[in-house]
Structure formats: C-alpha cells, structure tokens
C-alpha cells in the first residue's frame, strides 16, 4: 500500500509541478519593472522569455514578441532551452509513470517492467525539475548582474543636464512559480525512485516461496523461477504460490482475470 | 458619442470647499482613469491628479495632496473633486478628462469656472 | 517634476505657412520597454477645453488632419503644422505622459497673419 501512495502521490506532485513549469516558461513576468526608487512612472514594463510587455496607467496592454533569435542574449536562448528540455523531459516522464502506476493495468505487464519504469520516469522528473529551477536561476542571476549595473549607472550618469531614468528590473512571479515548480517536479521524482524501490521484485521473496510451494500439491509451471531474474510472467507466478511471504502491497497487487485498462 | 460633461460654475468664499461633478456617458466609465487639470485665466495647464473608478484609487500630484479629493460614483458614471481651503489662486477652470492609449488625455469635460472671491 | 520646455512662446504666420513648434523635456520620455515616446500634443482654441492632437510622440489621434505632425525622441520634440489655416489659431501645449505628476509646457501661441 505505501508503495502505492508513494507512487501515486509522486506522479501527482510532479504533475503540479510540470503543469507549473509550463505556466512558467509561458509566463510573461519573468522580470517587472523595479518601482522601489522609481515610483514615478505612469507604465509599467515587464519582460518574459518570449515577449515583453508595457502596461500604461491608461489600462491599456501592448506586448511585442521577439521575433528574432540571433539578436537575443545567449543567455536567454539558454534559459529557453533548459525550460524546454524540462518541460519535453517532464511530459515524457508523466506519459512513461502514467503506465507504470500499480493501480493502472496494461496486460500482463509485470511489476519488474513497472519498477523500470517507475525509476526511468522519476529520474526524468529529476532532470526535468533541475532544467526548470537551472533555467529560472540562471535568469535570476542575470537579473541580478544587470540590476547592479543599471544601479551603478544612476549614480555615475548624473553629471549631463539631461537625466534618462534608467529601467531596472527585478524578479518577476514567473521566477518563484519556477522555482517552485521545479522543486515540486524533483520532489515527484525521488517519490517514484523511492516506489521503484518498493515495486522491484526481490530474490529472497521468490526463493522463500518456491520452498514453500514445494510442501503444497500445487502443479506449478516451470516458468515459476524466472521471477528471480527480473523477467517473465511474475504476476502470473505470484498467483500460482498465493501462501508465499508477500507483503500486504503486493497481495492487493494481483490481477484477477477480469482487471483491464 | 464620448461626454463629459462637468458640473457649472462656482463663486466660493476663501477657506470653503467646493466640490465638481464630471459625468461622464458613450463609454463604459469603469474601464478608463479619469484625470483632472487645473488651468489659472491665460496661464498653461497643471495636472491635479486621476481617479481610477474600477478600483477607486486617486493618485495626486504632491502639490495639491491634502487639498483635493477624487472620488467616483459608478452607478451614476460620475467622477468627482473636492477642493478645500480655498484661495484665490484656487480661482481657475478645472477640466476633467479621460485618459486613453499612449496615456494621453483623448476627450475633456467643458470645465468648471471656479472663483474665489470675498 | 519633468519639466516642459517649449519654445517659441508665440508666433505669426500667413495662412499657407508651415510651421515648427518645439518642446524640449528635462528628462528623456522614451521608455525602454517598448521603445515609445510618452508625449502628446494639446490644441486649446480660445475659451475651448484642450484637444488631443499627437500622442506617442508621433501618432495622431483619429479625426485630426494630416497636416499635423509630430516627430522626436528622447527630450526633444517638434509639432510642425504642413499649411496652417486660419482655424488653427490656438495655443499649443506639449505632455509628459511617462513620469508623475504629468506635466505640461508652457504653452506656443499661434497667430494668423
């Protein structure tokens, strides 16, 4: 049962947390203007990874796309691409978990394959959450840099007559939903590397059964012991030697003949 | 067709208050700031200060902070200013106007003529 | 306080004439984020409210003739009038529109000979 729930809450959470990267990366406040030393003006510019937006006092919005690639900062085009790769990684990591849930069944899928696949898609969520909170600290860290020099720029640019009020930039919400998000989608991904755990099949379990078995009448195949190996129909084998140690998980595990998808 | 139609001319003595109506008709009113412009007999125009509606927030030019007061009524599509402790260089027209794109003031009430006299 | 500067205060021409007006900001109006000028130009006829000519520093406000120019980036501006005619005797006023309070020039007479 606590494999289950692990697995279960693990998909959920990384779920959250891929939906929250997506709502990032297409988010236009990645930084907004800094009004704390410039309370003064009557629009409001923020920027995202794909446009940047001004908001007038008037309520109106206009937003310009970027619609060029080479003249954009390498780093923004790097922030892009980790954001991206999280979120392919992510959705590809949500498609393989969907399959390898204990409470979905495919077949005669095997617990083994299941456990692969809970593991193989938890360390996508592990990838996935890292591009998300690498994309989202790198920008950060650009922001930073550039807030400083635009702040060092105030002070040394004030000996012409005429002022131009630099614009400074700070974090935006689409920062901390990505950084969030990120954390969320890693967090998912050690729960289903922990569940994979759970769901492996272990030698020992196999060995103690097949010894049991053996006191029983019960005509078992000869395919009983491919289970050790990590291949074969094991849930199939599992029916076969219903008075084995198992634990209460894998008990509520077994298919009946009429468990579809 | 856009109006603003502000309310009529108004003799008050030194340290009263007086307050103006702007109503306004032809748009919906809570979806544009109105803002309010003081201009002395053959002198230039000074900003008071807007009124958003939607959300009832005034911002006020530091200048006149204290002295006046925007409101506005949504149900009767009206925005108002109060101002008090009256001089006589409070005498003045004082325009409304409603503020659009490019935060530019697109279409102005006719103004109201305010004397301040003993 | 932005302060508009706008010169000439008054002048005089024949009706045909172009004519430049000019309006200088004590700090730049152009803002970053979309790279647009925040000024507009007032036409107020005698015992008239103002009326919106130019906002944007360049675009005009639908309804006014084509005659009517603006141009300038930064701090400084110009409103240039193509032929003047006589209905555009009036007094010209430049806006801050980027920076609180808003504020406007002094104002440029224009006479017709």
């Known amino acids: 049962m606590a494999v289950t729930a692990c697995q279960g809450l693990g998909f959920v959470v990384s779920l959250i947390g891929i939906a929250g990267i997506i709502a990032a990366t297409c988010m236009d406040q990645w930084s907004t203007q800094d009004l704390y030393n410039n309370p003064v003006t009557a629009v409001f510019n923020y920027q995202g990874l794909w446009r940047s937006c001004v908001r007038e006092s008037s309520g109106f919005t206009e937003c310009r796309g970027y619609f060029t690639l080479l003249g954009l900062p390498a780093m923004l085009q790097a922030v892009r691409a980790l954001m991206i790769v999280g979120i392919v990684l992510g959705a590809i990591g949500l498609l393989v978990s969907i399959f390898a849930l204990k409470c979905i069944r495919i077949g005669s899928m095997e617990d083994s394959a299941k456990a692969n696949m809970t593991l193989t898609s938890g360390i996508m969520f592990i990838v996935s959450g890292l591009c998300a909170i690498a994309g989202v600290s790198v920008f950060a860290n650009m922001l930073v840099t550039n807030f400083w020099m635009s702040t060092a720029n105030m002070y040394t640019g004030m000996g012409g007559m005429v002022q131009t009020v630099q614009t400074r930039y700070t974090f935006g919400a689409a920062l901390f939903v990505g950084w969030v998000a990120g954390g969320l989608t890693l967090i998912g991904g050690v729960m289903m590397c922990i569940a994979c755990r759970g769901l492996a099949p272990e030698e020992t379990n196999y060995k103690a059964v097949s010894y049991h078995a053996s006191g029983h009448s019960v005509a078992y195949k000869p395919g009983g012991f491919k289970a050790s190996t990590g291949f074969g129909s094991n849930t199939k084998n599992k029916k076969t030697y219903d008075g084995g140690a198992h634990t209460e998980d894998e008990l509520q595990s077994y298919p009946s003949k009429h468990d579809y998808v | 067709e856009v109006q603003l139609q502000e309310s009529g001319p108004e003799l008050v003595k030194p340290g009263a208050s007086v307050k103006m109506s702007c109503k306004a008709s032809?748009?919906?009113?809570?979806?544009?700031?109105i803002h309010w412009v003081k201009q002395k007999p053959g002198q230039g125009l000074e900003w008071i200060g807007y009124i958003n509606p939607y959300t009832d927030g005034p911002k006020y030019n530091e200048k006149f902070k204290g002295r006046a007061t925007l409101t506005s009524d949504k149900s009767s599509s009206t925005a108002y200013m109060e101002f008090s402790s009256l001089t006589s260089e409070d005498s003045a027209v004082y325009y409304c106007?409603?503020?659009?794109?490019?935060?530019?003031?697109?279409?102005w009430g006719q103004g109201t003529s305010v004397t301040v006299s003993s | 306080d932005i302060v508009m500067t706008q010169s000439p205060s008054s002048l005089s021409v024949s009706a045909g004439e172009k004519v430049t007006m000019s309006c200088k900001s004590s700090?730049?109006?152009?803002?970053?984020?979309?790279?647009?000028?925040?000024l507009a130009w007032y036409q107020q006829k005698p015992g008239q409210p103002p009326k919106l000519l130019i906002y944007?520093?360049?675009t005009r406000e639908s309804g006014v003739p084509d005659r009517f120019t603006g141009s300038g980036s930064g701090t400084d501006f110009a409103l240039t009038i193509s032929s003047v005619q006589a209905e555009d005797l009036a007094v010209y006023y430049c806006?801050?529109?980027?920076?609180?309070?808003?504020?406007f020039g002094s104002g440029t007479k224009l006479d017709i000979k």
């Open positions: 700090q730049s109006l152009l803002n970053n984020g979309n790279q647009k000028n925040y």
């Open positions: 032809g748009y919906t009113f809570t979806n544009y700031i």
């Open positions: 944007g520093a360049s």
């Open positions: 106007a409603r503020l659009n794109r490019g935060n530019a003031m697109d279409y």
């Open positions: 806006q801050n529109d980027l920076y609180y309070p808003f504020t």
